[in-house]
Each structure stands twice: as C-alpha cells, then as structure tokens.
Amino acid sequence: MAVTACQGLGFVVSLIGIAGIIAATCMDQWSTQDLYNNPVTAVFNYQGLWRSCVRESSGFTECRGYFTLLGLPAMLQAVRALMIVGIVLGAIGLLVSIFALKCIRIGSMEDSAKANMTLTSGIMFIVSGLCAIAGVSVFANMLVTNFWMSTANMYTGMGGMVQTVQTRYTFGAALFVGWVAGGLTLIGGVMMCIACRGLAPEETNYKAVSYHASGHSVAYKPGGFKASTGFGSNTKNKKIYDGGARTEDEVQSYPSKHDYV
C-alpha cells in the first residue's frame, strides 16, 4: 500500500513539475525590466526564451519573436536546449510511469518489469528536473552578470539594436516557476525510485519446493501468482484500470502552455 502511495504521489508530483517546466519554458517573463533606478517608466520591458515584450501604460503589449538563431547568445541557446530536453525527458518519463503504476494492470506484466519501468521513469524525472533547474540557473546567472555590467540590452547585437537606454533586467516570474517545477520533478523522480525498491520482487533464502504427485510435476514458487494474467472477468482489476484511465485524462487536460501576455 505504501509503495503504491509513494509511486502514485511521485507520479502526481512529477506531473505537476513537468507541467510547470512547460509553463516556464513558454512564459515571457524570464527577465523583467528592473524598475529600481527608473520606477517612473511608462514602458515596461520583459523577455522570454522565445520573444521579448513591451507593455505600455495603456496596457497594450507588443511582443517580437527572436527570428534569428545564429544571432542569439550561446547561453540562451543552451538554456532553450536544457528546457526542451527537460520537457522531452519528463514527457517520456510520464508515459513510462503511467504503465508502471501499480494500480494499473496491463496484460501479464511482471512486478519486476513494473519496478524497472518505475526506476526508468524516476531517473528520467530526476534528469528532467535537473535540466530545468540547470537551465533556469544558467539564465539567472546570465542576468546577474548582465545586471552588474549594466548592459543596455541582454541580447546585444541582436537585429542591429542600438544601445541607447540603460535598461537593466532582473529575475522574472518564469525563473521561480522553473526552479519550483524543476524541484518538484526532481522530488517526484526520487519518490519513483524509492517506490521501485518496494515493487521489486523480494529475494528469498529458500529454493522452490517440488512436490511429486501422481506423475505430475508442479512447481510452487513463492510470489509466483503476483502478476495478473489478464483482465478477463476480474472486475476488481477492471475497476482499477478505469481509475487509471481517469489519471490519463488528467494528464491530457493539464495546461501545458501558459500565455502571460
């Protein structure tokens, strides 16, 4: 029971974490204009991984995509890559972990297979979380460096921009979302790995005992009937599986993209 709870909780925590990583990656507020030196500006600038935006006092917001690949800093490209890798690994991890859930029975899948899948998804979640944390941290470091250098624009040289206004950028909401989401994914992955240990078939110190009866040789092995041999008319299994289907629906309905503009 504890194993199922740990596995289920790990899955849910990872799911929330990955949704957060996706949200952070799509958000435009990775860096926001620092208003400390210019609190009276009527034009507010903020930037994401994919575009930069300007919000005027009327509420009108104008966003421009970075329509160049080569003109962008290597660090920004690295952050993009880390976040995408984190999302991809997390998505695969989610897919694997759905089938690894103890409450979902698929064919005659052995507990050892479920344990392996749980471990695989756990590792994927851990790497996914680390990628997100690394990506956000690299970007934050880039911001701090640029802040103290008082650069006019974080992406200097992009599109032939003229450096005229001393606009300094500070941490945006996406960084905090990314850090929290990465942490949740990491925690979820650790929980999956812990659950994997409880799922693995226990090793026994005694050999299988053979009983000879009327010429038939039947071997009884401890725990040999743990895995279900199919759905059949097993209503209990069917009911549990239906529950799993609802979990899949929840995955599909979870917001995967947030537009904060």
Partner: antibody
C-alpha cells in the same frame, strides 16, 4: 464617435475646492486610461496624472499630489478631478484626455477643457 | 523629470512653404525593448484643445494629412510640414511619453504670413 464632454467653467474663491467632470462616450469606458492636463492662459501644457477606470488605479505628477484627486464612476462613464486649497496659481484650463491603446502612450482624444478661475 | 526643449518658439511662413520645428529631450525617449521612440506631437489651434498629430516619433495619427511628418530618435526630434496651409496656424507641442511625469515642450507657434 469618441467624445469627452467636460463640465462648464468654474469661478471659485481662494482656499475653496472644485470638482470637475469628464463624461466619456463612444467607446468602452473601462478599457482606456484617462489623463488630466493643465494649461495656464498663454502657457504650455502640464500633465497632472491619470486614472484607470477599470480598477480606479491612479498615478499623479508629484507636483499635483495633494492638490488633485482623480476618481471615476463606471455607471455614468465619467471621471472626476477635484482640486483643493485653490490659489491664483490654479487658475487654468483643465483638459481630460484619453490614452490611446496603440498610440505609444500618446493621448488620442481630448475634452474641450474646463476653465477654472480662482478669484476673491 | 524629462525636460523637453522646443525650438524655435515661433516662426512665420507663407502658405506652401516647408516648415521644420525641433524638439530635444533631456533623456533618451528610445525604448531598448522594442526600439521605439516614445514621443508625440500635438497641434493646438486657438480656442481648441490639443489634437494628436504624430505618435511614436514618426507614426501619423489617422486622419492627419500626410504633409505632417515626424522624425528623429533618442533625444532629437523634428516635425516637418512639407507645404504649410492656412489651417495649420497653431501651436505645436512635443511630449515625452516614455517616463512619468509626462512632460510637454513649451511649444512652437506657427504663424502664416
């Protein structure tokens, strides 16, 4: 058609207060910020502040803090400006002006102005 | 506060002539985020409220004749009237739209000979 109709001229005594109005029509009142501008006779323009009718958020020119108070009434699509502790320096024409949505923070429609004369 | 300085304070021209008036700001009005200049030009005819002519330093407001042209960037801006008409008699103001408090220039009075 967008229209900003301001209240009539005011003649007030020094030390008194005056409240003028600016009724908006022809657009969604809560979607646009309203600015107020002062113009003394034969002189230039001076920005007083703005009010956002959507949430009643205000921003004032430091020079007019304590002097001007901006309010709005959604039901009548009207913004108000109250000037307190009036002196001869406050004798001017006061205009309300709508902040355009895509006009780079410029004011696209102006009221005809309310003339305030402070005299004993 | 950003100080807006307009020159000349007044000018007198004949109908059909080209007119240029200048506006200088104490700080740059160019926003780095979108590379747009936050400066507007207004026309105020006698006894009337100001009317928006140009915003974003160079974008003409709808309904404004194309003889009015705005140019410049950063701290130096220009309003040009390619062929002055009698109805252009007015005071022209430039305005800082970048930072609060919004500030106006002292105005350039255009007279027709």
């Amino acid at each position: 058609e967008v229209q900003l109709q301001q209240s009539g001229p005011e003649l007030v005594k020094p030390g008194a207060s005056v409240k003028m109005s600016c009724k908006a029509s022809g657009y969604t009142f809560t979607s646009y910020i309203m600015h107020w501008v002062k113009q003394k006779p034969g002189q230039g323009l001076e920005w007083i502040g703005y009010i956002n009718p959507y949430n009643d958020g205000t921003k004032y020119n430091e020079k007019f803090k304590g002097k001007a108070t901006l309010t709005s009434d959604k039901s009548s699509s009207t913004v108000y400006m109250e000037l307190s502790s009036l002196t001869s320096e406050d004798s001017a024409v006061y205009c309300c002006a709508r902040l355009g949505f895509t006009t780079r923070n410029a004011m696209d429609y102006w009221g005809q102005g309310t003339s305030v004369t402070v005299s004993s | 506060d950003i100080v807006m300085t307009q020159s000349p304070s007044s000018l007198s021209v004949s109908a059909g002539e080209k007119v240029t008036m200048n506006c200088k700001s104490s700080q740059s009005l160019l926003n780095s985020g979108n590379q747009k200049n936050y400066l507007a030009w207004y026309q105020q005819k006698p006894g009337q409220p100001p009317k928006l002519l140009i915003y974003g330093a160079s974008t003409r407001e709808s309904g404004v004749p194309d003889r009015f042209t705005g140019s410049g960037s950063g701290t130096d801006f220009t309003l040009t009237i390619s062929s002055v008409q009698a109805e252009d008699l007015a005071v022209y103001y430039c305005q800082n739209d970048h930072s609060y408090p919004f500030t106006f220039g002292s105005g350039t009075k255009l007279e027709i000979k």
